[in-house]
Interface confidence: low
C-alpha cells in the first residue's frame, strides 16, 4: 500500500513519542560518537518536518524516502569528517548506496567511555528534574554502544527503565529498590543486544535464506501445533521485520513488528495455546512476551518422519519441484518433534538432508542412496549432547568463575592472537552457559546451551571482523553459520603461535584492585591469566592453577596490608619472579 508520504505514514502509525524515540535510536546507531545534544537537535528537526507532512502529504520533500530524509539530515553534521573520517565519504553517495555505506561503518566496539552509574539520589534528581531528557539519554547511550540493538525492544527496555525510576525514587530505600532493577535491565539488555546481533549477522553475512531457515526451526519448536503454511507466513513476516531493523529501517521495523504481534494474537487459536496472557498486554510488552513465549505442547501421535522424507518414492520428485519448500517442510516437521534440539543442530540435520538429496537424486537408484540418511544424523546429534554433558560436569565441579578460567585457557590456546579484552569478555560469557543452562533437565539443556553459545561466538566473530588477527577465527566465523560452535570446539592448540615476549608491566598490580567490585577483580585476574597463557601457551593446567592461586593469595594479602601500595610493589616483584620460575619463562 503506497503512501504519498512515507514519513507521514510512519508518524501517524507510531505516534509522536515512538517516532521520536526510534529516530533518536537510528541516528545514535549510525553516528555513535556524536554528542547527545546534536542528536536531539536532529531528531527535533526531523519530527517538525514529519508534522508538516502529516498536515499536507504533498508538501515539499514529503515524498522522499526515509533513507533520503535521514541520510540528508545526518550529512548536515558539521564535524562528520573530523569525527568519523572516511564515513564522511558516504555523504557523496546516492541512496541506496549511502545507507549501505553508513551501515558498513557501524562499530560493534566503539571507543566510548564505560558508563558509570551515578549515586541513586543523583539519578532520581535527574529523573524528576527532566524525565524526558533522562529517558532520551538512556536510549542514546544504549543505542550508540549497541548499534544493532533491536529498536522496538529498546523502547520496551526504556519503558521498564522509566517504571523502575518512577517506583523506586519514591521508595523508602531507593537504592535497595532501584539497583537490582537496573542490574537486571543491564544484563537483559546485553543479552538482547547479543541475540539481535546474531540475527543481523545471519541476514547480512549469510543471507535471507539462512535467517529464514533459523526462523522456521525456532518457530516450529515454539508453535508445533501450527500448520506449515502458518509457520511459513510468520517466518516471512518476521524476516521482513528483522531485515528492516538490521538495515537501519527502524520506523518500518517497529510498525511491522506491531502488525505481526496483532496478527499472531488475532490468530492465536491456529498458532499456539500459550499466547493468551501475552495477547492481553499493551503493545511493547505483548511483542516482547510473544518473542519469549514458551514452546506449546507437541501434538499427540505425530507420524514418523521417515514415511515422507525417506521411505516415500516421491522424495526426489517433491524435492525437485520446490527445493526450499520441501526442505522447509522437513525442517518444520523435524523441529516441531524436537524441542530438545538446538536450532543450530536442526539446521545441521537439514543441511545434511539437503546434501544427501542433492547427491542421491542424481544417482542411478536415488532411494537406495538416501535410504540411510537418518543414520548420518546420529553423530551430529551425539556431538553436542556429549559436549554439553562434559562441560556441565566440569561446571558443576568448578563453579562459574573457575569454569570461566578453564574456558579462558582453552580459548587462548586455540586463538592466542585475539586481543586479551575480547578473549576475557567472550570466555566469561561462554562460561555463563553453565549457570544459565546446566540447571535445566536434559530435554532443555541443548537448546539452551548451544543456541546461547551461537550468540556468544557471534560476539567473537563481529569483534574479530573489525580487526582480523587470526585466520582460524575468520575460517570458523565465515564458513558456516551453523557450524561455528563445532568449528571452535574442534580447534586445538595453535602450534603456529609464537609466544608473546614477557612484560613485567602486564603483571604489575596496584592498591586500586582492592576497591574494585568482585566482578571487576575477577576480570583483572582473568586478564592476567590470558596474558600468562599468551606468554606460555604450553603451560599445564596445574602450572597455571598454581600461579593463579599464588596471585589470589598475593592480592588478598596486600589488600589487608597497612601500606597496600608498598606491599603490591614488593610482593608483586616476588610473585612475578616465582611465576616466571614456575612456568619456565
Amino acid at each position: 500500500d503506497a503512501h504519498k508520504s512515507e514519513v507521514a505514514h510512519r508518524f501517524k502509525d507510531l505516534g509522536e513519542e515512538n517516532f521520536k524515540a526510534l529516530v533518536l535510536i537510528a541516528f545514535a546507531q549510525y553516528l555513535q560518537q556524536c554528542p547527545f545534544e546534536d542528536h536531539v537537535k536532529l531528531v527535533n528537526e526531523v519530527t517538525e518536518f514529519a508534522k508538516t507532512c502529516v498536515a499536507d502529504e504533498s508538501a515539499e520533500n514529503c515524498d522522499k524516502s526515509l533513507h533520503t530524509l535521514f541520510g540528508d539530515k545526518l550529512c548536515t553534521v558539521a564535524t562528520l569528517r573530523e569525527t568519523y573520517g572516511e564515513m564522511a565519504d558516504c555523504c557523496a553517495k546516492q541512496e541506496p548506496e549511502r545507507n549501505e555505506c553508513f551501515l558498513q561503518h557501524k562499530d560493534d566496539n566503539p571507543n566510548l567511555p564505560r558508563l558509570v552509574r551515578p549515586e541513586v539520589d543523583v539519578m532520581c534528581t535527574a529523573f524528576h528534574d527532566n524525565e524526558e531528557t533522562f529517558l532520551k539519554k538512556y536510549l542514546y547511550e544504549i543505542a550508540r554502544r549497541h548499534p544493532y540493538f533491536y529498536a522496538p525492544e529498546l523502547l520496551f527496555f526504556a519503558k521498564r527503565y522509566k517504571a523502575a525510576f518512577t517506583e523506586c525514587c519514591q521508595a523508602a530505600d531507593k537504592a535497595a529498590c532501584l539497583l537490582p532493577k537496573l542490574d537486571e535491565l543491564r544484563d537483559e539488555g546485553k543479552a538482547s543486544s547479543a541475540k539481535q546481533r546474531l540475527k543481523c549477522a545471519s541476514l547480512q553475512k549469510f543471507g535471507e535464506r539462512a535467517f529464514k531457515a533459523w526462523a522456521v526451526a525456532r518457530l516450529s519448536q515454539r508453535f508445533p501445533k501450527a500448520e506449515f503454511a502458518e509457520v511459513s507466513k510468520l517466518v516471512t513476516d518476521l524476516t521482513k521485520v528483522h531485515t528492516e531493523c538490521c538495515h537501519g529501517d527502524l520506523l518500518e521495523c517497529a510498525d511491522d513488528r506491531a502488525d505481526l504481534a496483532k496478527y499472531i494474537c488475532e490468530n492465536q487459536d491456529s498458532i499456539s495455546s500459550k499466547l493468551k496472557e501475552c495477547c492481553e498486554k499493551p503493545l511493547l510488552e505483548k511483542s516482547h512476551c510473544i518473542a519469549e513465549v514458551e514452546n506449546d505442547e507437541m501434538p499427540a501421535d505425530l507420524p514418523s518422519l521417515a514415511a515422507d522424507f525417506v521411505e516415500s518414492k516421491d522424495v526426489c520428485k517433491n524435492y525437485a519441484e520446490a527445493k526450499d519448500v520441501f526442505l522447509g517442510m522437513f525442517l518444520y516437521e523435524y523441529a516441531r518433534r524436537h524441542p530438545d534440539y538446538s536450532v543450530v543442530l536442526l539446521l545441521r540435520l537439514a543441511k545434511t538432508y539437503e546434501t544427501t538429496l542433492e547427491k542421491c537424486c542424481a544417482a542411478a537408484d536415488p532411494h537406495e542412496c538416501y535410504a540411510k540418511v537418518f543414520d548420518e544424523f546420529k553423530p551430529l546429534v551425539e556431538e553436542p549432547q556429549n559436549l554439553i554433558k562434559q562441560n556441565c560436569e566440569l561446571f558443576e565441579q568448578l563453579g562459574e568463575y573457575k569454569f570461566q578460567n578453564a574456558l579462558l585457557v582453552r580459548y587462548t590456546k586455540k586463538v592466542p592472537q585475539v586481543s586479551t579484552p575480547t578473549l576475557v569478555e567472550v570466555s566469561r560469557n561462554l562460561g555463563k552457559v553453565g549457570s544459565k543452562c546446566c540447571k535445566h533437565p536434559e530435554a532443555k539443556r541443548m537448546p539452551c546451551a548451544e543456541d546461547y553459545l551461537s550468540v556468544v561466538l557471534n560476539q567473537l566473530c563481529v569483534l574479530h571482523e573489525k580487526t582480523p588477527v587470526s585466520d582460524r577465527v575468520t575460517k570458523c566465523c565465515t564458513e558456516s553459520l551453523v557450524n561455528r560452535r563445532p568449528c571452535f570446539s574442534a580447534l586445538e592448540v595453535d602450534e603456529t603461535y609464537v609466544p608473546k615476549e614477557f612484560n613485567a608491566e602486564t603483571f604489575t598490580f596496584h592498591a586500586d584492585i582492592c576497591t574494585l567490585s568482585e566482578k571487576e577483580r575477577q576480570i583483572k585476574k582473568q586478564t592476567a591469566l590470558v596474558e600468562l597463557v599468551k606468554h606460555k601457551p604450553k603451560a599445564t593446567k596445574e602450572q597455571l592453577k598454581a600461579v593463579m592461586d599464588d596471585f589470589a593469595a598475593f592480592v588478598e594479602k596486600c589488600c589487608k596490608a597497612d601500606d597496600k601500595e608498598t606491599c603490591f610493589a614488593e610482593e608483586g616483584k616476588k610473585l612475578v619472579a616465582a611465576s616466571q620460575a614456575a612456568l619456565g619463562l
Epitope: 545441521r348 546434501t355 556431538e383 558456516s480 574442534a490 586445538e492 592448540v493 602450534e495
Partner: nanobody
Framework: DVQLVESGGGVVQPGGSLRLSCAAS????????MGWFRQAPGKEREFVAA????????YYADSVKGRFTISRDNSKNTVYLQMNSLRPEDTALYYC?????????????????WGQGTLVTVSS
C-alpha cells in the same frame, strides 16, 4: 599443498588384521584433522574414521566401531588405521584425507586433500 600417500593394503582372510599408514608431506601435519574413507566397487565413498589434530577426538562409522582404531604420530607426519576382525564387506579402496577444519568429521566434501588410495581385499 599437502601430499598424502597410503600404504599397508593387501589381501587378508576374514577375521584377520591389517594396519594402514598414511604419510603426509608439504604442510604442517599437526594442524590437520585426518580421516579415512573407503569406496567399495560400484558404491559411494563412505566415511570410516577421523582423528583431531592432537588425537583428543576420534570418530568412527558405526560399521567399524570396536574393530578399527585410528591414531596418528605428529612427529612422523603419519596417520594409521588399525583394522581388526576384518569382514568381506570391508573390501574397498581406502583413502586418507586431510582437512584444516571439518564441520563434521563424516562428510567427505569437508576434506581438502586426498591420497590415491590403498586396496584392501577381505576374502577366504
Amino acid at each position: 599443498d599437502v601430499q598424502l600417500v597410503e600404504s599397508g593394503g593387501g589381501v587378508v582372510q576374514p577375521g584377520g588384521s591389517l594396519r594402514l599408514s598414511c604419510a603426509a608431506s608439504g604442510g604442517t601435519f599437526s594442524t590437520y584433522v585426518m580421516g579415512w574413507f573407503r569406496q567399495a566397487p560400484g558404491k559411494e565413498r563412505e566415511f570410516v574414521a577421523a582423528i583431531s589434530q592432537n588425537s583428543i577426538h576420534t570418530y568412527y562409522a558405526d560399521s567399524v566401531k570396536g574393530r578399527f582404531t585410528i591414531s596418528r604420530d605428529n612427529s612422523k607426519n603419519t596417520v594409521y588405521l588399525q583394522m581388526n576382525s576384518l569382514r568381506p564387506e570391508d573390501t574397498a579402496l581406502y583413502y586418507c584425507a586431510a582437512s584444516r577444519f571439518t564441520s563434521w568429521y563424516t562428510a567427505d566434501y569437508e576434506y581438502d586433500y586426498w591420497g590415491q588410495g590403498t586396496l584392501v581385499t577381505v576374502s577366504s
